[in-house]
């Protein structure tokens, strides 16, 4: 039952500083964009994974900004109409449509800055945005699949004889969970209406010598263990230990 | 062929002692589960009397038949007894072996049953 | 000790009608219940475990829902065959596996 683990290709400057929040970019710093600049246009659309609670930036294609026309940016998120933030340079004037979420912002003026930040990453922010960029020789197009991610809560508990229950709660995507050793475990999932699910793994040991059991839950926010002491008393509860 | 293949009918007097047999075949005899004993007295419900780890040993009785019943097992031949002392007419029933993994796959194979009659 | 409470103890019902049986329990069992069919002269046979799953083989017509300490078994439109006694089961807790009393469903 191993987890897929996390595509840390997909994690890049992520950092935390003091007591702000975790910052995830994809952007490019200005040294790259020349080298690197056919293939960025050739890669349309990125998918991303992104904790929730972070803080996230996404980029406009590297553009020189002296050669625009037009930049928009188009937000589709589950359930809501499309947004577009739209800004004109010949004009220097900005356009909202069907934006309502303030946690969604220019980084700076777009002028001088065609990204797009989210401030803080929430669990409604999934979704596709795209960045388009209007220029004299054409239209460059720069999409990314945003996938909020939430670190489940996790509990290990022994409910009745030689049965342990381990749950991995609210998590996004759902975590995955094994045991050391392997016993004999029934597991549910439960879906809640803000995309979150619950992992609930319960095991049962036979053999007499299995004396402390490891949860090991697998999530792309991290991975953790938990173990417990089986006790022999009937519906004894032990509180789990985290390594 | 997976099945659990118990012992034929017995007769028996009232304080005397039963044992019967249950024997697994085609699955392994081994950890991770219990083979659980059921009976059923004629014309009424299922009573669950109790089981044994296949694995450990470990034995779990009902209530009601605490001191008067015994499971055992034998891996080498993949058998497992239920023995109920001290018989009297009301233990007339057909007993029953099932397999059981405590929470994946609950009783998921059951003996043919053997009837044993109390009778003086 | 778990107590299980089946009801009704017995049914009289017409082909393709809807059976619904239901089963108590004394104290919370979390999604821990069987429910089997068993013909006279036959063992036990497992339809559902967990509660709501299916066991293999049995046709979709039959149900379960429920969890904590209220279950019901539902067969869906009734056939001949389905004439049998019906028992929930609880296996929530090792050390005690107690069956409801049984459901007896007769054909009209």
């Known amino acids: 039952e191993g987890a897929a683990q996390p595509n840390n290709s997909l994690m890049l400057q992520t950092s935390k500083e003091n007591h702000a929040l975790a910052s995830s970019s994809l952007c490019m710093d200005e040294k790259q964009i020349t080298q690197n600049y056919s293939k960025v246009l050739a890669e349309v659309n990125t998918s991303w994974p992104v904790k929730m609670a972070t803080n996230a930036v996404l980029c406009c294609p590297p553009i020189a900004l002296r050669n625009l026309i037009i930049i928009t940016w188009e937000i589709i998120l589950r359930g809501q109409p499309s947004c577009t933030k739209a800004y004109r340079k010949e004009t220097n004037e900005t356009k909202e449509t069907n934006c309502t979420d303030e946690r969604i912002t220019w980084v700076s003026r777009p002028d001088q800055n065609s990204d797009l930040q989210i401030r803080p990453v929430a669990i409604t922010h999934d979704g596709y945005y795209r960045c388009i960029m209007v220029t004299p020789d054409g239209n460059f197009h720069r999409g990314y699949h945003l996938q909020v991610l939430v670190t489940p809560e996790l509990t290990l508990f022994q409910n009745r004889n030689r049965t342990a229950v381990c749950k991995a709660v609210a998590g996004k995507p759902a975590a995955q969970i094994s045991w050391i050793p392997e016993g004999d475990c029934a597991t549910k999932q439960e879906y809640w209406s803000n995309g979150t699910v619950t992992v609930k793994s319960t095991c049962h040991w036979e053999v007499h010598n299995v004396s402390t059991v490891t949860c090991h839950v697998s999530h792309l926010t991290g991975n953790k263990s938990l173990y417990i002491e089986l006790l022999p008393v009937p519906g004894a509860k032990k509180s789990a230990k985290l390594y | 062929q997976v099945q659990l293949v118990q012992s034929g009918a017995e007769v028996k007097k009232p304080g005397a002692s039963v044992k019967v047999s249950c024997k697994a075949s085609?699955?392994?005899?081994?950890?991770?589960?219990?083979m659980a004993w059921v009976r059923q007295a004629p014309g009424q419900g299922l009573e669950w009397m109790g089981l044994?780890?296949?694995?450990?040993?470990?034995?779990w009785y009902a209530q009601k038949f605490q001191g008067r019943v015994t499971m055992t097992r034998d891996t080498s031949t993949s058998t497992v007894y239920m023995e109920l002392s001290s018989l009297r007419s009301e233990d007339t029933a057909v007993y029953y072996c099932?397999?059981?993994?405590?929470?994946?796959?609950?009783?998921?194979?059951w003996g043919q049953g053997t009837l044993v009659t109390v009778s003086s | 000790e778990i107590v299980l409470t089946q009801s009704p103890d017995f049914q009289s019902v017409t082909p393709k009608e809807k059976v619904t049986i239901t089963c108590q329990a004394s104290e919370s069992i979390d999604s821990y219940l069987l429910w089997y069919q068993q013909k006279p002269d036959q063992s036990p046979k497992l339809l559902i475990k967990?509660?709501?799953t299916l066991a293999s083989g049995v046709p979709s017509r039959f149900s379960g829902s429920g969890s904590g300490t209220d279950f019901t078994l539902t067969i869906n439109s009734l056939e001949a065959e389905d004439a049998a006694t019906y028992y929930c089961?609880?296996?929530?807790?090792?050390?005690?596996?107690?069956f409801g009393g049984g459901t007896k469903v007769e054909i009209k």
């Open positions: 099932a397999r059981h993994f405590a929470l994946s796959d609950p009783f998921n194979l």
């Open positions: 967990q509660a709501s």
């Open positions: 085609g699955f392994s005899f081994s950890s991770g589960y219990y």
């Open positions: 044994i780890g296949v694995g450990s040993g470990s034995l």
């Open positions: 089961q609880n296996y929530y807790d090792i050390s005690s596996n107690d």
